[in-house]
Interface confidence: low
């Protein structure tokens, strides 16, 4: 029995619902009474959801899963996972048994967009060309870990003297803090780009130092 799932990971935003697609080709005369369907976590074999003896056996996964009962007879064994969390990320196996059996695994990639970065400057007054300043770029509650890029006003990457730290909160979402130490020129714009590598989503923050005053776009 051939069981088909998407090759690419399913990407789901934290808090939204995700559909893990799985399908099989029912033979003529197939009835749901013959179907045994099991969704389980690939690595631990933990039961997620099952269908047997013509009945939906329900969710064994925090009551956040559901099948598409009206579509099962057409060979659609997809699983709906509600209110996706970071902890849900991983591989799920769809196991279908009628007379013979087949299985396939689908990967769930969880993502959350990063907030617009907030920019802080230290020191933040009486600045003169030649002073060394510390610019901190902070962005919150994203997933997975961000890629952080700094650029000057001409779009040239600034790679020296950058320290980036990322810490996960209790939901597994990351707060990112990136610190750039730079010697001031006569004036300049310093931009921080926080990129979510899964969503291909960029969050921008910048600070412009023009002697006095500073502006935070």
């Amino acid at each position: 029995l051939e069981v088909q799932v998407p090759e690419d990971p399913v990407v789901a935003l934290v808090g939204t619902d995700a559909t893990l697609c799985c399908s099989f080709s029912p033979e003529p005369g197939f009835s749901l009474a013959q179907l045994n369907l099991i969704w389980q976590l690939t690595d631990t074999k933990q039961l997620v959801h099952s269908f047997a003896e013509g009945q939906d056996q329900g969710s064994a996964y925090a009551n956040r899963t559901a099948l598409f009962p009206d579509l099962l007879a057409q060979g659609n064994a997809s699983l709906r996972l509600q209110r996706v969390r970071v902890a849900d990320e991983g591989s799920f196996t769809c196991f279908v048994s009628i007379r013979d059996f087949g299985s396939a695994a689908v990967s769930l990639q969880v993502a959350a967009p990063y907030s617009k970065p907030s920019m802080t400057l230290e020191p933040n007054k009486d600045l003169r060309p030649g002073d060394t300043v510390t610019i901190t770029c902070s962005s919150y509650r994203g997933y997975p870990e961000a890629e952080v890029f700094w650029q000057d006003g001409q779009g040239v990457p600034l790679t020296g003297n950058v320290t980036t730290s990322q810490m996960a909160n209790e939901q597994g979402l990351f707060d990112v803090h990136s610190v750039l130490r730079v010697v001031l020129g006569a004036n300049g714009t310093y931009s921080c780009l926080v990129r979510n590598p899964v969503l291909q989503q960029d969050a921008h923050g910048s600070v412009t130092i023009t002697g006095q005053p500073m502006t935070f776009p």
């Epitope: 690419d8 040239v156 590598p197 291909q200 989503q201």
Partner: antibody
Framework: EVQLLESGGGLVQPGGSLRLSCAAS????????MSWVRQAPGKGLEWVAG???????YYADSVKGRFTISRDNSKNTLYLQMNSLRAEDTATYYC????????WGQGTTVTVSS | QSVLTQPPSASGTPGQRVTISCSGS????????VHWYQQLPGTAPKLLIY???RRPSGVPDRFSGSKSGTSASLAISGLQSEDEANYYC???????????FGGGTKLTVL
């Protein structure tokens, strides 16, 4: 000055292959995601493929399995290997920086015809 | 047929304000940032608006971008004859796992 220069276009028969190159200068090529976008004569823009700075690749459904995007950071060059070419692949191909193409090349023309 | 829908044409007279729309879904515009491109006749496109509402240096402040729900808009105020061009919206699509362009809008300055 940031510049992208495409090359490798030309006339090829259906089913044939072609490799496009894009030479980058004026920026730290290895740090940037790069893309290919095409435009058929008289038509709109179509994103073809993208490659992350870490070399993960993405493709439009229309070219999946036929086209391969790659990069050589030591040469500051982006490539698009095009196999099993079809008439509908006829277009001007542009390379660009980032997936959202903040810098574009001037384009190279690919014609697929017998 | 593009997943991102733009009107095929738009027009205005010099000095007018013109808006071009771009409609998508929760998988693209609804969750991702939108970019706009200008393509003058016979030239390569150029980035006009990025990250929904930001202008690259050199782009006049007559051009502005915005987004609401699953739709985005490009506004051009004080329309000038040199604004006559094709305009494209674009964004990432989470379901297709690829970057998408709208079908394009041909702007005519009357």
């Amino acid at each position: 000055e940031v510049q992208l220069l495409e090359s490798g276009g030309g006339l090829v028969q259906p089913g044939g292959s072609l490799r496009l190159s894009c030479a980058a200068s004026g920026f730290s090529f290895s740090n940037y995601d790069m893309s290919w976008v095409r435009q058929a004569p008289g038509k709109g823009l179509e994103w073809v493929a993208g490659i992350r700075s870490g070399s993960r690749t993405y493709y439009a459904d229309s070219v999946k399995g036929r086209f391969t995007i790659s990069r050589d950071n030591s040469k500051n060059t982006l490539y698009l290997q095009m196999n099993s070419l079809r008439a509908e692949d006829t277009a001007t191909y542009y390379c660009g920086r980032y997936f959202n193409m903040d810098v574009w090349g001037q384009g190279t023309t690919v014609t697929v015809s017998s | 047929q593009s997943v991102l829908t733009q009107p095929p044409s738009a027009s205005g007279t010099p000095g007018q304000r013109v808006t071009i729309s771009c409609s998508g879904s929760t998988f693209n515009i609804g969750t991702n940032l939108v970019h706009w491109y200008q393509q003058l006749p016979g030239t390569a496109p150029k980035l006009l608006i990025y990250l929904t509402d930001r202008r690259p240096s050199g782009v006049p402040d007559r051009f502005s971008g915005s987004k609401s729900g699953t739709s985005a808009s490009l506004a051009i105020s004080g329309l000038q004859s040199e604004d006559e061009a094709n305009y494209y919206c674009a964004t990432w699509d989470d379901s297709l796992n690829s970057f998408l362009f709208g079908g394009g809008t041909k702007l005519t300055v009357l």
